[in-house]
C-alpha cells in the first residue's frame, strides 16, 4: 500500500492489502476502500468499466468475468488498485476476439487469464499449425499477449492463446489477426494517355490508375491553376491483400476550347504524394498542317531519282491523300504512313518516289490531303537538269551560221574558229545574234537558245565549232570551210 509524508493527501487504502487477489468462481469478492474522502470504485477489464459509489465492493457469487482491476479513488484524485483473478476451471481466458494490428507496431491479443498460476502462457497457431518463425510475443496475465512488430505476412493469421492448467494445454477461442499495412512508398499513379486533342463538343474522358497497399489512399483529379472540383467516377479492385487498384475517370461530356489545359491526377498516402498529368487541347475545328521535308523547288539531273517527302499534321485522321502531276493522279510510286504508332499520333509522312526522271518529266507535283473538316495541299516544282542538245546547225542564205540548242538550265552557245587542220579551236568568235526561243513558253522543260555568227568574216580554210553547254554538260557541232578560188563553200556540218 502507498505511503506519503504527513500533511500531504494520501491515496486510499484497500483491504485486503494486496496487489493481487485470487478468488474461486462462486465465492465472494469483498473489497473495502478506506479513505475519509472516498469517491468511487471502478472496475476495468477488456475496455469495459463499471463504477460503484459504495466504499465496499461486494460481488456475492464471483464469475470469471469479474476478473480485472479494481481501483479506488478519493476526492484528491489519488487512487489505489487491486487486481482480482476469479479462478474458473471452465473459463481460463477472458477474450475480446477483435484483433487488429498495424504493420511494424505491437498489438495486444486480449486474452487475460483468470488464473495467474497456470504455466506456459503463450500463443499457438490454429489447427496445430506453427506460428510464423519470426513472430515474437510477450505475455502478461492481466492484459493478454503482445505480438511485437506485426508483419504484413501475419494478415489473417489464426491463433489461440494457450496455457497449461493442471498439466493440460488449454486454448482460448480463436483470434484472426487483421493487419493494417504501413505505407512505405508513395502511391503508383499512371494515366491512360499523356495528351488529348479534341474538337469542340467531343467528349473528353481520361482515366488515372492509382495503386497502393490499401484503399485508404487519397486521390483526386485537379485542373492546374484552378480550384474547381472536377467530377470523377471510381472503380476499384483488391487484387489480393495489400494490392489495391483504383481507376479514377474524369469526364467532360462536351469539351470546349476553354477546357484546354493540364489536368493532374494527384494521390497521397501517409508516406507521401505522387502525381501524373495529361494535356487536353480542344480546337474549334479540325486542321491539316503540311511541312515539306525537302525544298519545294527541286533540281534533279536527267536520269536520276528524287523523293518528294512531306510530313503533315492532321486532326481528325486524314481520309484521302493523293499525289498529282499534270492533272494525273499517281496510283503507285508513293506511300503514306503515320509518324508513330502512338494512338494519339496526329503526324503522318507521305513520300512520292520519282525514278530515272526524263527531261520531259519536270513540272509541278502536288500533294493533296483531306479529313472530315479541311483540305490542304502543297506543290513541288521539279526541274530536270539536261545536257544541251543541238537541235539544228545550218548556214543560212544570208551567209549566217546558226546553231539552235536545247537544255536545262538554259544553255550558253559559244563559237570557235579553227584555222586549217588544227584540232584546237581556241579563237572565239562573237555571235551576231542570240535569242532564247521559248522564254514565254511553259515554265518547265528544256530552254531553247539560238545563236548566229556571220561566216563572211572567215578568210581561210578551217572549222567553225558551235559549243552549247550548261551545268550538266556540253555538246558541239562543226562547220567545215574550204575556199576554191574566190568561192567559199560550206562543207556539211557535223557534230
Amino acid at each position: 500500500q502507498p505511503s506519503v509524508s504527513p500533511g500531504e493527501p494520501s491515496p486510499p487504502s484497500i483491504h485486503p492489502a494486496k496487489s493481487e487477489l485470487i478468488v474461486r468462481v462462486g465465492n465472494e469478492i469483498r473489497l473495502l476502500c478506506i479513505d475519509p474522502g472516498f469517491v468511487k470504485w471502478t472496475f476495468e477489464i477488456l475496455d469495459e468499466t463499471n463504477e460503484n459509489k459504495q466504499n465496499e465492493w461486494i460481488t456475492e457469487k464471483a464469475e470469471a468475468t469479474n476478473t480485472g482491476k479494481y481501483t479506488c479513488t478519493n476526492k484528491h484524485g489519488l487512487s489505489s488498485s487491486i487486481y482480482v483473478f476469479v479462478r474458473d476451471p471452465a473459463k481460463l481466458f477472458l477474450v475480446d476476439r477483435s484483433l487488429y494490428g498495424k504493420e511494424d507496431n505491437d498489438t495486444l491479443v486480449r486474452c487475460p487469464l483468470t488464473d495467474p498460476e497456470v504455466t506456459s502462457y503463450s500463443l499457438k497457431g490454429c489447427q496445430g499449425k506453427p506460428l510464423p518463425k519470426d513472430l515474437r510475443f510477450v505475455p502478461d496475465p492481466k492484459a493478454g499477449i503482445t505480438i511485437k512488430s506485426v508483419k504484413r505476412a501475419y494478415h489473417r493469421l489464426c491463433l489461440h492463446c494457450s496455457a497449461d492448467q493442471e498439466g493440460k494445454s488449454v486454448l482460448s477461442d480463436k483470434f484472426i489477426l487483421k493487419v493494417r499495412p504501413a505505407f512505405k512508398a508513395v502511391p503508383v499513379v499512371s494515366v491512360s494517355k499523356a495528351s488529348y486533342l479534341l474538337r469542340e463538343g467531343e467528349e473528353f474522358t481520361v482515366t488515372c490508375t492509382i495503386k497502393d497497399v490499401s484503399s485508404s489512399v487519397y486521390s483526386t483529379w485537379k485542373r492546374e491553376n484552378s480550384q474547381t472540383k472536377l467530377q470523377e467516377k471510381y472503380n476499384s479492385w483488391h487484387h489480393g491483400d495489400f494490392n489495391y487498384e483504383r481507376q479514377a475517370t474524369l469526364t467532360i461530356s462536351s469539351a470546349r476550347v476553354n477546357d484546354s489545359g493540364v489536368f493532374m491526377c494527384y494521390a497521397n498516402n501517409t508516406f507521401g504524394s505522387a502525381n501524373v498529368t495529361t494535356t487536353l487541347e480542344v480546337v474549334d475545328k479540325g486542321f491539316i498542317n503540311i511541312f515539306p521535308m525537302i525544298n519545294t523547288t527541286v533540281f534533279v539531273n536527267d536520269g536520276e531519282n528524287v523523293d518528294l517527302i512531306v510530313e503533315y499534321e492532321a486532326f481528325p485522321k486524314p481520309e484521302h491523300q493523293q499525289w498529282i502531276y499534270m492533272n494525273r493522279t499517281f496510283t503507285d510510286k508513293w506511300e503514306d504512313y503515320p509518324k508513330s504508332e502512338n494512338e494519339s499520333n496526329i503526324r503522318y509522312v507521305s513520300e512520292l518516289h520519282l525514278t530515272r526522271l526524263k527531261g520531259t518529266e519536270g513540272g509541278t507535283y502536288t500533294f493533296l490531303v483531306s479529313n472530315s473538316d479541311v483540305n490542304a495541299s502543297i506543290a513541288f516544282n521539279v526541274y530536270v537538269n539536261t545536257k544541251p542538245e543541238i537541235l539544228t546547225y545550218d548556214r543560212l542564205v544570208n551567209g549566217m551560221l546558226q546553231c539552235v540548242a536545247a537544255g536545262f538550265p538554259e544553255p550558253t552557245i559559244d563559237w570557235y574558229f579553227c584555222p586549217g587542220t588544227e584540232q584546237r579551236c581556241s579563237a572565239s568568235v562573237l555571235p551576231v545574234d542570240v535569242q532564247t526561243l521559248n522564254a514565254s513558253g511553259p515554265p518547265f522543260g528544256k530552254l531553247v537558245v539560238q545563236s548566229s555568227i556571220d561566216s563572211s568574216a572567215f578568210k581561210h580554210n578551217g572549222t567553225v565549232e558551235c559549243k552549247a553547254y550548261n551545268d550538266v554538260g556540253k555538246t558541239s557541232a562543226y562547220f567545215n570551210f574550204a575556199f576554191k578560188g574566190n568561192n567559199k563553200e560550206q562543207i556539211h556540218p557535223h557534230t
Epitope: L46, D47, E48, D96, S98, Y100, G101, K102, T107, R156, K178, R180, S214, S215, S216, V217, Y218, Y234, N235, S236, W237, H238, G240, D241, Y244, N269, T270
Partner: antibody
Framework: QVQLVQSGAEVKKPGSSVKVSCKAS????????ISWVRQAPGQGLEWMGG????????NYAQKFQGRVTITADESTSTAYMELSSLRSEDTAVYYC????????????WGRGTLVTVSS | DIQMTQSPSSLSASVGDRVTITCRAS??????LNWYQQKPGKAPKLLIY???SLQSGVPSRFSGSGSGTDFTLTISSLQPEDFATYYC????????FGGGTKVEIK
C-alpha cells in the same frame, strides 16, 4: 467486448441533411475499418462507404459519391455519416459496421438508426 | 460494380432439412466472399468469411464453399433459430451484397 453504439432515429425533410454517429466502445478503433450500410424497408443491404480512422481517407460507393461524407474522431472513438440532399427513397435503417475496407468482412454491427425522410 | 446474384430468393424448409443457397458473382472475386444472417428488426450477423471460414461462435452446421464466381452456403441440419434472410457479400471491388434469400418454415 467491443460494441458499436449508434445515435437515435431521425425524421428529416426532403433536401435536408442527416448526420448519424457510431461510437465504438473499446478496442483499437483507429485501425478498425468502419463502414456504413443501409437497408430500405423490405429491401436488401447497400454499402455506402467506409473509413479507417488512422488513415483518415474515406472510400465511398459510386452511387453516393458527392452526397455522403464519412468522418471519424479518434479522440472519442466515434464515426459519423452525413447524407445530404435527402429524398424519400433515402428512408432506411442505417447501420454502422466494423469492416468493409481492404477486404475486411463486417464482423460487428451497430443496432441501426432509422432515418425517415418525409415532407 | 460487381453484381451478386443469389438464388433462390426464398425457400421453404423444415427443421432438420439440409439447405443450400448459392451466390454468383458477375466476375471473379477469388475467395473474398462473406455470408450474413439477418432476422427481422435486427442487424446482420457474420456467419462465414473468406468463402469458407466459420466465424467464431457460429454453429458448425453452417459451412461455405466456392471460389472465383460461384459460392454456396450450406446449413446441414436446419434449426428453428435459422429461419431468417441470408446475404452474400463480395469484397474485391466496391462492396456489393446479393439480393438475399429468405428461409421460411414449410
Amino acid at each position: 467486448q467491443v460494441q458499436l453504439v449508434q445515435s437515435g432515429a431521425e425524421v428529416k425533410k426532403p433536401g435536408s441533411s442527416v448526420k448519424v454517429s457510431c461510437k465504438a466502445s473499446g478496442g483499437t478503433f483507429r485501425i478498425y475499418a468502419i463502414s456504413w450500410v443501409r437497408q430500405a424497408p423490405g429491401q436488401g443491404l447497400e454499402w455506402m462507404g467506409g473509413i479507417i480512422p488512422d488513415f483518415g481517407v474515406a472510400n465511398y460507393a459510386q452511387k453516393f459519391q458527392g452526397r455522403v461524407t464519412i468522418t471519424a474522431d479518434e479522440s472519442t472513438s466515434t464515426a459519423y455519416m452525413e447524407l445530404s440532399s435527402l429524398r424519400s427513397e433515402d428512408t432506411a435503417v442505417y447501420y454502422c459496421a466494423r469492416g468493409g475496407l481492404d477486404t475486411d468482412e463486417f464482423d460487428l454491427w451497430g443496432r441501426g438508426t432509422l432515418v425517415t425522410v418525409s415532407s | 460494380d460487381i453484381q451478386m446474384t443469389q438464388s433462390p430468393s426464398s425457400l421453404s424448409a423444415s427443421v432438420g432439412d439440409r439447405v443450400t443457397i448459392t451466390c454468383r458473382a458477375s466476375q471473379s472475386i477469388n475467395s473474398y466472399l462473406n455470408w450474413y444472417q439477418q432476422k427481422p428488426g435486427k442487424a446482420p450477423k457474420l456467419l462465414i468469411y473468406a468463402a469458407s471460414s466459420l466465424q467464431s461462435g457460429v454453429p458448425s452446421r453452417f459451412s461455405g464453399s466456392g471460389s472465383g464466381t460461384d459460392f454456396t452456403l450450406t446449413i446441414s441440419s436446419l434449426q428453428p433459430e435459422d429461419f431468417a434472410t441470408y446475404y452474400c457479400q463480395q469484397g474485391v471491388s466496391d462492396i456489393t451484397f446479393g439480393g438475399g434469400t429468405k428461409v421460411e418454415i414449410k
